[in-house]
Each structure stands twice: as structure tokens, then as C-alpha cells.
């Protein structure tokens, strides 16, 4: 898919039409990050339990297993985000795949994802008022990681 | 930060100026996902070695430790992406934080990130030729995860 660059719009960071014309969202749709879960979702139900599988996708084979929770908002771009939810407080033993090892903690890896919300612009009123795309950083957990507990100084 | 929607640009998916005016990439920079490393980069040199620290950022405390490698392309938006590079083939022992445990593999978690490349538009020539933003999925490794090896059926 190509976005064709044409002349006639010299300040694109603020060059977007009023709501009636609609294209900025079309454009944002292309420019937003791909947000389906990084790994194929688990085919087996045990991905929802605190155990490390010997098959299936990475999130179910990890000794810090996680599931993906959908976070959907039709008035946000991207509309769909997926949060990794750790299924165990500690890491699962590599030997058994089920017993937890208190020497390791299963913790989420967080990332600040840029998202956009549509807001009426300040001071704009009436039927043809302009809209602002409000950029926000939105915390998303990408995965769960097995770490050694932090030693306090 | 707000992006103000103004009138006067009725086809935003294809409304971008020629290269000399530069704004489309500025705008894309805002609209693309935040791509700095999820964790603060480690200040200590041991993050680059195959061991699990007891302090520091998550990528150095993980028993599947990783470093972040910068991937910069000035003709891509975002220009900077960070790839997680696993520092160990196997997971580090929770007990020692240094010896590797062959029962676990340290593997990257991949994600298809939407990126844009700037390309001359087909059939466009001359000094004021227009440019196209080509949307592509680009594989990025987000982190390294300790998993039980896959058992082949």
C-alpha cells in the first residue's frame, strides 16, 4: 500500500480537515502500528494456566507464561491493543514446567505506545467545528519475563 | 501534544508535499508507535554479557538477558527501531545468575511493526518529483524470553 505524496499541503502536522471530510483517520489507520499480539495466540486452553507448555506459541512455552488481554477502544488509534498478563507470580521450573521457583519473579515488560484520541479543539463550537488528534503515551505490557529479584542496596 | 485538524487539505491519505517541504515525515513521526526501548538502557557493562544481574533494568535482570540494538534508517519512519538481541543461547540459572541451564532456551519475541519507507512515486521525475510513503510490516524483536524447548511430535 502506498501513500502518495502530493503538493498543496505545506504544514502536515496540523493539516487535517474538519470531521466532515474524514481523511485524517483514514491516514492514521495506515500509519498506526500493527497491534495484533506478537505471537500467534495459543491453540490450547492450558495457555491460561500457570504452566510452561512444551509446544504451542512462545507465550505458553515461556517459564513466565502470559496471555494476551484485548484492550479495544473504537475512538482510539490503534483501536486494538493487547496487554500481556502474567499467569504466574514466579517463574515456572524448567524441569517440571509446572512448579514455581521462588528464586525467580515473572514480571511484565512495559512499553509506552503512542496512541491518538480525537478531541474537539479548544474554543471550537458549532456544527463545523474542527477536531484535534490528541497524542498520548499509553502503557502496554508486551510480554512477561523471568527475572532475578532485585537486591535492595 | 495535540495535532490540530485544520481545513484545506481534503485528501489526507495522499495529501503530502514534495520532498523539499518535509512535513509528512514529521507527521508520521508523531503518528507512528513509540519505538524507544521499553526498558531504560543498561548503564552497566555486564548487561552485554550472558548473566542475569540482581539490579538494573529488566533486560539485564532477566534469565534470558538481552541488549538493544539500534536499527536506524533515515528513509524509514520511524527512523529508529530497537531490536532485542539475546545474550545467551540458553537461560541463565536462577541460582547463580551466570551458569546456563540447557533445559531452557533464550529466544526472541518477534512483532510485526508497521513502518513507512519513502520512495519516489512511479513515473515521477525531475527536481520537484513527488514521493510515496510505502507501508510495510517490519519484524522487530521486542525482548528475549526463557522457554522450554519445543517437543517435536
Amino acid at each position: 500500500v502506498s501513500l502518495r505524496i502530493q503538493e498543496g499541503c505545506s504544514h502536515l502536522p496540523s493539516c487535517c480537515p474538519s470531521k466532515e471530510q474524514e481523511p485524517p483517520e483514514e491516514w492514521l489507520k495506515w500509519s498506526s502500528a500493527s497491534v495484533s499480539p506478537p505471537e500467534p495466540l495459543s491453540h490450547t486452553h492450558h495457555a491460561e494456566s500457570c504452566r510452561a507448555s512444551k509446544d504451542g506459541p512462545l507465550n505458553s512455552r515461556a517459564i513466565s507464561p502470559w496471555s494476551y488481554e484485548l484492550d479495544r477502544d473504537l475512538n482510539r488509534v490503534p483501536q486494538d491493543l493487547y496487554h500481556a498478563r502474567c499467569l504466574c507470580p514466579h517463574c515456572v521450573s524448567l524441569q517440571t514446567g509446572s512448579h514455581m521457583d521462588p528464586l525467580g519473579n515473572s514480571v511484565p515488560l512495559y512499553h509506552n505506545q503512542t496512541v491518538f484520541y480525537r478531541r474537539p479543539c479548544h474554543g471550537e463550537e458549532g456544527t463545523h467545528r474542527r477536531y484535534c488528534l490528541e497524542r498520548r503515551l499509553y502503557r502496554v505490557s508486551l510480554a512477561c519475563v523471568c527475572v532475578r529479584p532485585r537486591v535492595m542496596a | 501534544v495535540s495535532l490540530r485538524i485544520q481545513e484545506g487539505c481534503s485528501h489526507l491519505p495522499s495529501c503530502c508535499p514534495s520532498k523539499e517541504q518535509e512535513p509528512p515525515e514529521e507527521w508520521l513521526k508523531w503518528s507512528s508507535a513509540s519505538v524507544s526501548p521499553p526498558e531504560p538502557l543498561s548503564h552497566t557493562h555486564h548487561a552485554e554479557s550472558c548473566r542475569a544481574s540482581k539490579d538494573g533494568p529488566l533486560n539485564s535482570r532477566a534469565i534470558s538477558p538481552w541488549s538493544y540494538e539500534l536499527d536506524r534508517d533515515l528513509n524509514r519512519v520511524p527512523q529508529d527501531l530497537y531490536h532485542a538481541r539475546c545474550l545467551c543461547p540458553h537461560c541463565v540459572s536462577l541460582q547463580t545468575g551466570s551458569h546456563m541451564d540447557p533445559l531452557g532456551n533464550s529466544v526472541p519475541l518477534y512483532h510485526n511493526q508497521t513502518v513507512f519507507y519513502r520512495r519516489p512515486c512511479h513515473g515521477e521525475e525531475g527536481t520537484h518529483r513527488r514521493y510515496c510513503l510505502e507501508r510495510r510490516l517490519y519484524r522487530v524483536s521486542l525482548a528475549c524470553v526463557c522457554v522450554r524447548p519445543r517437543v517435536m511430535a
Epitope: T44, H45, L74, Q79, D80 | -
Partner: antibody
Framework: QVQLVQSGAEVKKPGASVKVSCKAS????????ISWVRQAPGQGLEWLGW????????KYAQKVQDRITMTTDASTTTAYMELRNLRSDDTAVYYC?????????????WGQGTLVTVSS | DIQMTQSPSSLSASVGDRVTITCRAS??????LNWYQQKPGKAPKLLIY???SLQSGVPLRFSGSGSGTDFTLTISSLQPEDFGIYIC?????????FGGGTKVEIK
């Protein structure tokens, strides 16, 4: 009672465009989204996409994303679905449905359907 | 895309019977599954959302269960007005997808 009332049946030639309307009433339009679903004769349901009524943000099914545009008009609480470059396999009943804007994306109220026939 | 497979494709049961329809997703969809009833020439009607929540106004004889990949719609005591096609839908990943439907006939 929530109501979604759709425009009437259409007969189009291949290559033409069709624009179906969906007038919503008896609820706060901007608090929901509108989804569009079609059903070819004797076939199952196919999701085409949706739009957040407040934001106008859309998500389209890949199969039709190059040919479809969904819009809303808050002043008349009406949603529109335009499909361009029609083909014979676009012949179907097109439904609009109300959808919540959050994670629980169920379609709790539906329009009566609009039959679009594409034939040369 | 996630495939939704319903079984059986059709069934015939008597008034008062307990009827069970299953829906299987090609991958884990957590609890993001809805059930609809569709009668000939009519729009679908929501029965169950998020796998087990009963939509307002739907009779208590309808219930839903399951999570992950396997889901069930149960009609505890079939009534004459329950004929029609029952359709499952996943909403976990776009594109949203529907099952092929189970046609329920009254004996």
C-alpha cells in the same frame, strides 16, 4: 427502544457504487460505534468493519478495505457505508448494527437490512 | 483470520428438549464470543455476549459457557419460537468472524 433504520433496496451495475444509510434513534449516538455486516444469499454473516461514532475512526476488513468507506453524521445520527467498484459477489443483504466502543464488542441492535443486488 | 466452526450444522428437536450447540475457534479467543439467533428474512438477534452473559430480554432458558477455544450454547427447554439459525461470533481479533450457523428445527 433503540432503533436502526436502513435505506431501501438498491440494484446496481458492476463497477458502480452504492451508499447505504443507517439512521439511529433512541440512544446517545456518539457513545457507540456502528458496525456493518453483510450476508450473501444463502450464506453466512461477513463482518465488513466498524466506525466509532464520536471519533470517526474506522477499521475495515482487509477483503474490502480498498473499496469501502464508513462515515457518520452526528447531526442526523446517521451512519453510512459506501462500497465502490461493485462486483456480482457483492450481492447481499447489508446490515448495520450498534456496537459498544469498548472491549466487549457485541452487536446488540441491528438494522432491518438493505438488499444490494449487483447485476449487469 | 480466526475460523469459527459450529456443530452440528443442523438439528431437529422436540419442544421441551435440551439442545446444545458447540462453537470452536481456530485459536484462543479468551471469552470474546457472542451468540446470535437469526430467523428467515430477519436480522440477527443477540442472545449471549462475552461467552456467558445473557442479553437483556432474552429468556433464561438460553445460556452460554466456555472460554479459550471451545464454547457451548444451551437451550434448557426448547420452545416452538426457538426455531432458526444460531450463529457464534468471535470479537477477539479483527476481522471479526462468524460461525457458519446451526439450523434448529422443531420436530
Amino acid at each position: 427502544q433503540v432503533q436502526l433504520v436502513q435505506s431501501g433496496a438498491e440494484v446496481k451495475k458492476p463497477g458502480a457504487s452504492v451508499k447505504v444509510s443507517c439512521k439511529a434513534s433512541e440512544y446517545t449516538f456518539s457513545n457507540y460505534g456502528i458496525s456493518w455486516v453483510r450476508q450473501a444469499p444463502g450464506q453466512g454473516l461477513e463482518w465488513l468493519g466498524w466506525i466509532g461514532a464520536y471519533s470517526g475512526f474506522t477499521k475495515y476488513a482487509q477483503k474490502v478495505q480498498d473499496r469501502i468507506t464508513m462515515t457518520t453524521d452526528a447531526s442526523t445520527t446517521t451512519a453510512y457505508m459506501e462500497l465502490r467498484n461493485l462486483r456480482s459477489d457483492d450481492t447481499a443483504v447489508y446490515y448495520c448494527a450498534r456496537v459498544g466502543t469498548g472491549t466487549d464488542s457485541y452487536f446488540d441492535f441491528w438494522g432491518q437490512g438493505t438488499l444490494v443486488t449487483v447485476s449487469s | 483470520d480466526i475460523q469459527m466452526t459450529q456443530s452440528p450444522s443442523s438439528l431437529s428437536a422436540s419442544v421441551g428438549d435440551r439442545v446444545t450447540i458447540t462453537c470452536r475457534a481456530s485459536q484462543n479467543i479468551n471469552s470474546h464470543l457472542n451468540w446470535y439467533q437469526q430467523k428467515p428474512g430477519k436480522a440477527p438477534k443477540l442472545l449471549i455476549y462475552t461467552a456467558s452473559s445473557l442479553q437483556s430480554g432474552v429468556p433464561l432458558r438460553f445460556s452460554g459457557s466456555g472460554s479459550g477455544t471451545d464454547f457451548t450454547l444451551t437451550i434448557s427447554s426448547l420452545q416452538p419460537e426457538d426455531f432458526g439459525i444460531y450463529i457464534c461470533q468471535q470479537t477477539y481479533i479483527t476481522p471479526l468472524t462468524f460461525g457458519g450457523g446451526t439450523k434448529v428445527e422443531i420436530k
